[in-house]
Interface confidence: medium
């Protein structure tokens, strides 16, 4: 029997034990979050699988993920949404301490897919563990990219009150129009529900005392947000380590001074 021809992509293949990992994460999530106990994890996996299995992995659409999005519907209380761009680890450390605030990865669908890669093959029921399309080198409409675009859009659309975003002050473009935050989330915040966007610019260097809220890319973000009738605020977080420590222990005397 001749081996069936398999498309070689430029990106790494599906994460090892992907179906079992998604199911395991779903079960863990529903156990820890009482409001999601009604979710049937087998149905969630079936919907997830249905979005990409047997489909050409450069032709995935947001429509493919709608059954999954429907099953994973969750709401975040107003003022409790935390977006991030290029600074995922700190954002997650923050919500692990500040348990009443939520990033996308603290929600069921984001939690299921965080740090995973997946893709299938056209006309077969196989998962491709060898390679998956790379966003730059192969195509943007790949299963992983379309998933994050879909759930990020939905996450932004449902946000209300004051929305916070953590931005990486160490990068040349603190606000990057091509990031998921810049290209998807910013444009899907609903002015009738969101009063303000507050950006937290995280400084990298210990001696960095510049006001990064004056950075040209932050001014660009302010302009985009203001045009959408959403107020914009910006804060420098000069000491991210101290910032986290003060979230944990707000009564600490050193937290009364600036962070």
């Amino acid at each position: 029997v001749l081996p069936r021809w398999r498309q070689q992509w430029s990106g790494s293949g599906t994460t090892s034990r992907f179906p079992e990992t998604v199911l395991a994460r779903c079960v863990k999530y529903t156990e820890v979050h009482p409001e999601m106990r009604h979710v049937d994890c087998q149905s969630v996996w079936d919907a997830f699988k249905g979005a990409f299995i047997s489909k050409y992995p450069c032709n995935i659409t947001e429509e493919d993920y709608q059954p999954l999005v429907k099953l994973g519907t969750q709401t975040v209380p107003c003022n409790k949404t935390l977006l991030w761009s290029r600074i995922k680890d700190l954002a997650h450390q923050f919500t692990q301490v500040q348990r009443d605030m939520f990033t996308l990865e603290d929600m069921l669908l984001g939690y299921l897919a965080d740090d995973l890669t997946w893709c299938g093959e056209f006309n077969t029921f196989e998962i491709n563990y060898q390679s998956c399309p790379d966003w730059r080198k192969d195509c943007s409409n790949n299963p992983v990219s379309v998933f994050w675009k879909t759930v990020s859009r939905r996450f932004a659309e449902t946000a209300c009150g004051v929305v916070h975003v953590m931005l990486n002050g160490s990068r040349s473009k603190i606000f990057d129009k091509n990031s998921t935050f810049g290209s998807v989330e910013v444009h899907n915040l609903q002015p009738e529900k969101v009063q303000a966007l507050e950006a937290w610019v995280i400084h990298g260097g210990r001696e960095d005392s510049r006001d990064l809220c004056q950075d040209p890319t932050i001014k660009e973000l302010e302009s985009i947000i203001s045009k959408r009738n959403i107020r914009f605020f910006c804060k420098n977080i000069y000491r991210p380590d101290k910032f986290l420590q003060c979230v944990k222990n707000p009564e600490d005397s050193s937290c009364l001074s600036g962070i």
Partner: antibody, heavy 120, light 110 residues
Framework: EVLLLESGGGLVQPGGSLRLSCAAS????????MSWVRQAPGKGLEWVST????????YYADSVKGRFTISRDNSKNTLYLQMNSLRAEDTAVYYC?????????????WGQGTTVTVSS | QSVLTQPPSASGTPGQRVTMSCSGN????????VYWYQQVPGTAPKLLIY???QRPSGVPDRFSGSKSGTSASLAISGLQSEDEADYYC???????????FGGGTKLTVL
């Protein structure tokens, strides 16, 4: 120190039952998946069963499916293996192992094992 | 008969480099991470390699893992007498929905 201590092994007749226990200490038991692995005399390792943090997901080897039941009591930091309809081929040293299933780090801590002998 | 195939024995002299193999198929080794365990006779197994080629803290860098297609290998350089043990490869098998071990390789340090 991270420790796993198995107990409950012994001599049992074919068709009989036995319940193994594994007491965990030195780590947050309720944060980890757990597994049982066995080793017949002079043979290699054979995976038996794996249980998720809150027992929402359980896997069994085909050789024990329908006869063995894995369970855990997170309040007691203890893992169990209920073995029914025992056969001679179940004779082995049974190890419990701390299992980093979700992180793919493998079974990084093992107990010293408890011996099960099935013989008439 | 184990799902993963390992040579039953291997040997080497102190200071030498030895390599042992573990062979499987697409559903296990190729599509999943490989783990290696060391078992000194009369003791419990010990995790040696995880995620194909990663060493847990405390495992000397003389031990290294690699994977190519449906085969994995464990290499031990600068062989020492205390390395005399049984070595098992393990992985997940997607079609069996089970963890699978190799039959083990008995390493003798001459």
């Amino acid at each position: 120190e991270v420790l796993l201590l198995e107990s409950g092994g012994g001599l049992v007749q074919p068709g009989g039952s036995l319940r193994l226990s594994c007491a965990a200490s030195g780590f947050t038991f309720s944060d980890y998946w757990m597994s049982w692995v066995r080793q017949a005399p002079g043979k290699g390792l054979e995976w038996v069963s794996t249980i998720s943090i809150s027992a929402g997901i359980i896997y069994y080897a085909d050789s024990v499916k329908g006869r063995f039941t894995i369970s855990r009591d997170n309040s007691k930091n203890t893992l169990y293996l209920q073995m029914n309809s025992l056969r001679a081929e179940d004779t082995a040293v049974y190890y419990c192992a701390k299992d980093n299933w979700n992180d793919y780090y493998g079974m990084d801590v093992w107990g010293q094992g408890t011996t099960v002998t099935v013989s008439s | 008969q184990s799902v993963l195939t390992q040579p039953p024995s291997a040997s080497g002299t102190p200071g030498q480099r030895v390599t042992m193999s573990c062979s499987g198929n697409n559903q296990n080794i190729r599509d999943n991470y490989v783990y290696w365990y060391q078992q000194v006779p009369g003791t419990a197994p010990k995790l040696l390699i995880y995620k194909d080629d990663q060493r847990p803290s405390g495992v000397p860098d003389r031990f290294s893992g690699s994977k190519s297609g449906t085969s994995a290998s464990l290499a031990i350089s600068g062989l020492q007498s205390e390395d005399e043990a049984d070595y098992y490869c393990a992985t997940w098998d997607g079609s069996l929905k089970a963890r699978v071990f190799g039959g083990g390789t008995k390493l003798t340090v001459l």
